[in-house]
């Protein structure tokens, strides 16, 4: 059986070493042990007896099926303790008694169907982080099992297989920064939301099948949600389950930000937010985020029509991986508020985007990512953008773009512009010169020749560039990274040349250590603070005697250097 | 209507390793929470992993975590189980099966497949 390694802090590391028992010789010298992925199986009453001092104790994955109810009394400075993935089919309150300073408590992922026959956690005054619950078993939350816990930063239930809710098991909680709830279905959902509703400011629902859920008004008085953002992950929604969904919203007038994440949407968008208050009621939700969102019948989907009166105050929308090939002209002008739209990921061509963004779309839109879809012309993108008035910041990375022409139009505030990723060999007068910021990394260019008189940021890694571009274009240039390319070497006179350079990464180029290169960064100890990756990432890569040298380790020959 | 056919299942080592697949026919498999459980003789169903829809969420009972991964393929209508430092405990029939619901639940299940028998010696 292997021993534990300790470093001087008193960090134990125990993980994976086949113990079956907490190992023997265990002190108050210790702040932290991890015995996560052993076969333990049973914690004794003195086991743990030494670890006075004890803050962390990480037990996850350790078969643990029986823990002697005293078994953590000495652990009165315990802050983290992980119980997760065990095989422990019932809790005791005993074991949390003595633990008056923890602050974070996983049990889940072991096998009980309840929290305990009496309330788990009175004593724990201190928590901030509870997560509890399975995917098979854990049936039943009860008023009892958050008794004496008052205020959580985070709560993560895993209750998927829950077949009752005693109503108000969790309005004892009066303060919840992050609630995460797993709930394979929505029958209890409506019962959970009026117990939440005073206390929860973030409401996280994960893996739900909401296709059947009906709402109906909530037993509550007039009360004042703190609730800023909802998210859903992995749900499944129809468009009735929609509708009915939205009505929950008016009882979150605070409500500032709503996220789709993995979702499956069994419907066509055909969505009827009958309720006139409804649409009122969404007027603070700022941000609204769909990501990988899966519509079956994705090519019959509606025009969205029904929702445009919705969406009129959002400011930042985002809708990535989700097979979104249009947003028709009328719902762009509908989107009046938008300041920040990004469909990355998706199926946009030049052609569909030029009704998307037509005359009055997105009025206020200031940030447009595009990032990976399916465009090819570089200059019928800027041409087509033209309409978007306040437009300062464009990312078209990801694009396969054909070669960019000699002159091309875009959008006249733009200041912002990221190409990184789109197989461009050369840089050409296309790109606009009232450019304050340029991102052309991860590209063919092997040579930069484009004079940008308001540049301050370029960013040209991981390309094929040999030196460092001239100075005399970027009069204004505050930061240029430019790892990963070819470059073999830089001088004073070069870094000199840029009069305002603030921050340059050009770490992990193939730098030839020359008697000039390495008598400028002796003689330069000021490198380390224009040179934000230095030493570590500035490695010669010739002559073969120095190969793989740090440039600030590296001495010059003697002989070579002085003749 | 979706049938499910196991396949993979056979004898092993202590130590070793296997990959169960479960090929689904039928339409909208992409629809569908897809399941592992598995049953010695005489014992109830035991959950053993779950998968929703996308393949975003995974989870498992704690007596498998860290040694079996589940995994779908949409494209091919199969889900995986990859089992690996199999224990004679792990001797069971694997069962597949289909729902609607994200759940280590048994009763939640709507389709199941017949079975495919691991025997794990030591």
């Known amino acids: 059986q292997e021993s534990l390694s300790c470093d001087a802090s008193g960090v134990c590391d125990g993980r994976s070493r086949s113990f079956t028992s907490i190992p023997s010789g265990l002190t108050a010298a210790m702040k932290s042990l991890d015995l996560s992925f052993n076969k333990i199986t049973y914690i004794g009453h003195g086991d743990l007896r030494a670890c006075a001092n004890l803050q962390v104790l990480i037990l996850k994955s350790s078969r643990i099926n029986t823990i002697e109810g005293d078994a953590f009394y000495s652990l009165g400075s315990l802050e983290h303790l992980d119980l997760s993935d065990n095989h422990l089919s019932s809790l005791s309150s005993s074991w949390f008694g003595p633990l008056s300073s923890l602050k974070y408590l996983n049990l889940m992922g072991n096998p009980y169907q309840t929290l305990g026959v009496t309330s788990l956690f009175p004593n724990l005054t201190n928590l901030q982080t509870l997560r509890i619950g399975n995917v098979e078993t854990f049936s039943e939350i009860r008023r009892i099992d958050f008794a004496g816990l008052t205020s959580l930063n985070e709560l993560e239930i895993k209750a998927l297989s829950l077949r009752n809710y005693q109503s108000q098991s969790l309005k004892s909680i009066r303060d919840i920064h992050h609630l995460t709830l797993h709930l394979s279905e929505s029958a209890f959902l409506l019962e959970i939301f009026a117990d939440i509703l005073s206390s929860v400011r973030y409401l996280e629902l994960r893996d739900t099948n909401l296709a059947r859920f009906q709402f109906s008004p909530l037993p509550v008085d007039e009360v004042s949600s703190p609730m800023k953002k909802l998210a859903f992950r992995g749900s499944v929604l129809t468009d009735e389950s929609f509708n009915e969904l939205l009505k929950l919203l008016r009882y979150i007038l605070e409500l500032s930000e709503v996220e789709f994440d993995d979702c499956t949407l069994n419907g066509l968008g055909d969505f009827n937010p009958s309720e006139s208050d409804v649409v009122s009621e969404l007027g603070k939700v700022e941000t609204v985020t769909i990501r990988r969102l899966h519509i079956p019948q994705f090519y019959l989907f509606y025009d969205l029509s029904t929702v445009y009166s919705l969406l009129e105050k959002v400011k930042r929308i985002t809708v990535e991986n989700s097979k979104v090939f249009l947003v028709p002209c009328s719902f762009s002008q509908h989107l009046k508020s938008l300041e920040f739209l990004d469909l990355s990921e998706n199926l946009m061509v030049e052609e569909y985007l030029k009704n998307s963004a037509c005359k009055g779309a997105w009025p206020s839109l200031q940030t447009l990512v595009l990032s990976q879809n399916h465009l090819r012309s570089m200059q019928k993108t800027g041409e087509i953008l033209l309409t978007l008035k306040n437009l300062t910041s464009l990312d078209i990375s990801r694009n396969t773009f054909h070669p960019m022409p000699d002159s091309c139009q875009w959008p006249e505030k733009m200041r912002f512009l990221n190409l990184s990723s789109t197989g461009i060999r050369v840089v050409k007068t296309c790109i606009p010169q009232t450019l304050e910021v340029l991102d052309v990394s991860n590209n063919n260019l092997d040579s930069f020749s484009l004079f940008l008189p308001r540049l301050q940021e370029l960013y040209i890694s991981r390309n094929k560039l040999k030196t460092l571009p001239d100075a005399s274009l970027f009069p204004v240039l505050l930061v240029m990274k430019i790892r990963e390319n070819a470059v073999s070497t830089f001088s004073k006179d070069q870094l000199g040349s840029f009069p305002k350079l603030e921050t340059l990464e050009a770490g992990d180029n193939h730098f030839v250590c020359s008697c000039e290169l390495l008598s400028f960064t002796m003689e330069t100890p000021a490198l380390a603070q224009i040179l934000v990756d230095w030493p570590d990432s500035y490695l010669c890569d010739s002559p073969p005697r120095l190969h793989g040298h740090r440039l600030q380790d590296a001495r010059p020959s003697v002989l070579e250097c002085h003749q | 209507e979706v049938q499910l056919v196991e396949s993979g299942g056979g004898l092993v080592q202590a130590g070793g390793s296997l990959r169960l697949s479960c090929a689904a026919s039928g339409r909208a498999f992409s629809s569908y929470v897809m399941g592992w459980f598995r049953q010695t003789p005489g014992k109830e169903r035991e959950f053993v992993s779950v998968i929703n829809w996308s393949g975003g969420s995974t989870d498992y009972s704690s007596s498998v975590k860290g040694r079996f991964t589940i995994s779908r393929d949409n494209a091919k209508n199969t889900v995986y189980l990859q089992m690996t430092s199999l224990e004679p405990e792990d001797t069971a029939v694997y069962y597949c099966?289909?729902?609607?619901?994200?759940?280590?639940?048994?009763?939640?299940?709507?389709?199941w497949g017949q079975g495919t028998p691991v025997t794990v010696s030591s």
């Open positions: 099966a289909a729902g609607q619901y994200y759940t280590g639940r048994s009763d939640r299940y709507d389709y």
